[in-house]
C-alpha cells in the first residue's frame, strides 16, 4: 500500500452570489467502497470543519440538509460547491479524503484551495 495523494486547485474565486466550486481528486491506493470527504477551513493555525459527507462508491454524495456544501462524485473525483459565502469567509479550504472501508483505512489531505469571496456592492437606488 502507498500514501494517498489528494489534489485540489490552488485558488478559486467565489461568484458574486457567494458560491464557490472546486474539484477534489484523490489517487485511491485500494478498492474503497466507502469514502468520506470533509471540507476543512484553515484560518491562522485554527482548523474547523465546514462540511462532511460519506458515500458509497458509485452512489451520490449526500451532505446533511443544513450543510452549506453540495457535491457530486465520479470515480475518484468529487465536485464540491460551497454556498452562502461572505467576504469574511475568504480563506484556505482543505479537502480531506478518507477511505473508510474496507480496511486498511487511508487518509489523504489536499494542500488547500484559497477561496476569495468579495461581497457584492449594494445596488444604488434607481431614479425614475
Amino acid at each position: 500500500c502507498k500514501a494517498m495523494h489528494v489534489a485540489q486547485p490552488a485558488v478559486v474565486l467565489a461568484s458574486s452570489r457567494g458560491i464557490a466550486s472546486f474539484v477534489c481528486e484523490y489517487a485511491s491506493p485500494g478498492k474503497a467502497t466507502e469514502v468520506r470527504v470533509t471540507v476543512l477551513r484553515q484560518a491562522d493555525s485554527q482548523v474547523t470543519e465546514v462540511c462532511a459527507a460519506t458515500y458509497m462508491m458509485g452512489n451520490e454524495l449526500t451532505f446533511l440538509d443544513d450543510s452549506i456544501c453540495t457535491g457530486t462524485s465520479s470515480g475518484n473525483q468529487v465536485n464540491l460547491t460551497i454556498q452562502g459565502l461572505r467576504a469574511m469567509d475568504t480563506g484556505l479550504y482543505i479537502c480531506k479524503v478518507e477511505l473508510m472501508y474496507p480496511p486498511p483505512y487511508y487518509l489523504g489531505i489536499g494542500n488547500g484551495t484559497q477561496i476569495y469571496v468579495i461581497d457584492p456592492e449594494p445596488c444604488p437606488d434607481s431614479d425614475f
Epitope: K2, A3, V47
Partner: antibody
Framework: QVQLVESGGGVVQPGRSLRLSCAAS????????MHWVRQAPGKGLEWVAV????????HYADSVKGRATISRDNSKNTLYLQMNSLRAEDTAVYYC???????????WGRGTLVTVSS | EIVLTQSPGTLSLSPGERATLSCRAS???????LAWYQQKPGQAPRLLIY???SRATGIPDRFSGSGSGTDFTLTISRLEPEDFAVYYC?????????FGPGTKVDIK
C-alpha cells in the same frame, strides 16, 4: 478545554475480560476519530484501535484483533474498549487519544493501567 | 504495515546543543501524515509536530520537523533542560497507525 479521562483499569487474571472507558469533554465528540494507544512498562507506544465519527467504522491492530472491541456513545461523549481473553502481554497503560481533524493525535488522557497477572 | 525506524536509540547531549533525530519509514508516507511526540516519565505523550513540519500549538520554535517520502527529521536547535525525554515519530495516513520505537535524549 479538551479533556479525556480514562477509567476501568486494574489487575485482571489471564483469560478474563475488562472494559475501559474514556470520558471526553470540551469538543464536538462526533467530529473526531477516537483512538486507544497503549504502552507496556518500559516500552514504546503501540496503537490499538480507532472508531470513526458515528462508530460504524472501526480498525484494530493485529495484536488485539478478535479480542478487542472499540465503541463509542456520542450521546454520552464516551469511548470504550472491551478487551477479552486477556494475556500477560496486554499489560500496559492504555491511553485514550483524539484524532485531530487533520488526523494527528492532538489530545491524550493520562492513561489507565491494566495489569494482567495471576 | 508501515514500519518506522528511529535513530539513534539514545542521544546523549548537553543543554544548549543541537539534537537531530531521524525517522525512517519502510514505505513512502505522505508528509501530511507524519507526527512527532515527546514523552516524559510518568506522563502521556505530547504532540510536537504534525504534517512533518508544522509545530503544534504552544510548541517552542526550537523544535522543527522536516522530510518527505521515507525520511523524516526532528531537530531541536538548542536543548533546554526540559527537552530531555523520549521522542516518537508516528504515521497516521494508513491503518494500522504506527509509532517508531523512540529516541531517548538524555543529559551527557
Amino acid at each position: 478545554q479538551v479533556q479525556l479521562v480514562e477509567s476501568g483499569g486494574g489487575v485482571v487474571q489471564p483469560g478474563r475480560s475488562l472494559r475501559l472507558s474514556c470520558a471526553a469533554s470540551g469538543f464536538t465528540f462526533s467530529s473526531h476519530g477516537m483512538h486507544w494507544v497503549r504502552q507496556a512498562p518500559g516500552k514504546g507506544l503501540e496503537w490499538v484501535a480507532v472508531t470513526w465519527y458515528d462508530g460504524s467504522n472501526k480498525h484494530y491492530a493485529d495484536s488485539v484483533k478478535g479480542r478487542a472491541t472499540i465503541s463509542r456513545d456520542n450521546s454520552k461523549n464516551t469511548l470504550y474498549l472491551q478487551m477479552n481473553s486477556l494475556r500477560a502481554e496486554d499489560t500496559a497503560v492504555y491511553y485514550c487519544t483524539r484524532g485531530d481533524l487533520l488526523g494527528y493525535f492532538d489530545y491524550w488522557g493520562r492513561g489507565t493501567l491494566v495489569t494482567v497477572s495471576s | 504495515e508501515i514500519v518506522l525506524t528511529q535513530s539513534p536509540g539514545t542521544l546523549s547531549l548537553s543543554p544548549g546543543e543541537r539534537a537531530t533525530l531521524s525517522c525512517r519509514a519502510s514505505q513512502s508516507v505522505s508528509s501530511s501524515c507524519l507526527a512527532w511526540y515527546q514523552q516524559k516519565p510518568g506522563q502521556a505523550p505530547r504532540l510536537l509536530i504534525y504534517g512533518a513540519s508544522s509545530r503544534a500549538t504552544g510548541i517552542p520554535d526550537r523544535f522543527s520537523g522536516s522530510g518527505s517520502g521515507t525520511d523524516f527529521t526532528l531537530t531541536i536547535s538548542r536543548l533546554e533542560p526540559e527537552d530531555f525525554a523520549v521522542y516518537y515519530c508516528q504515521q497516521y495516513g494508513i491503518s494500522p497507525f504506527t509509532f517508531g520505537p523512540g529516541t531517548k535524549v538524555d543529559i551527557k
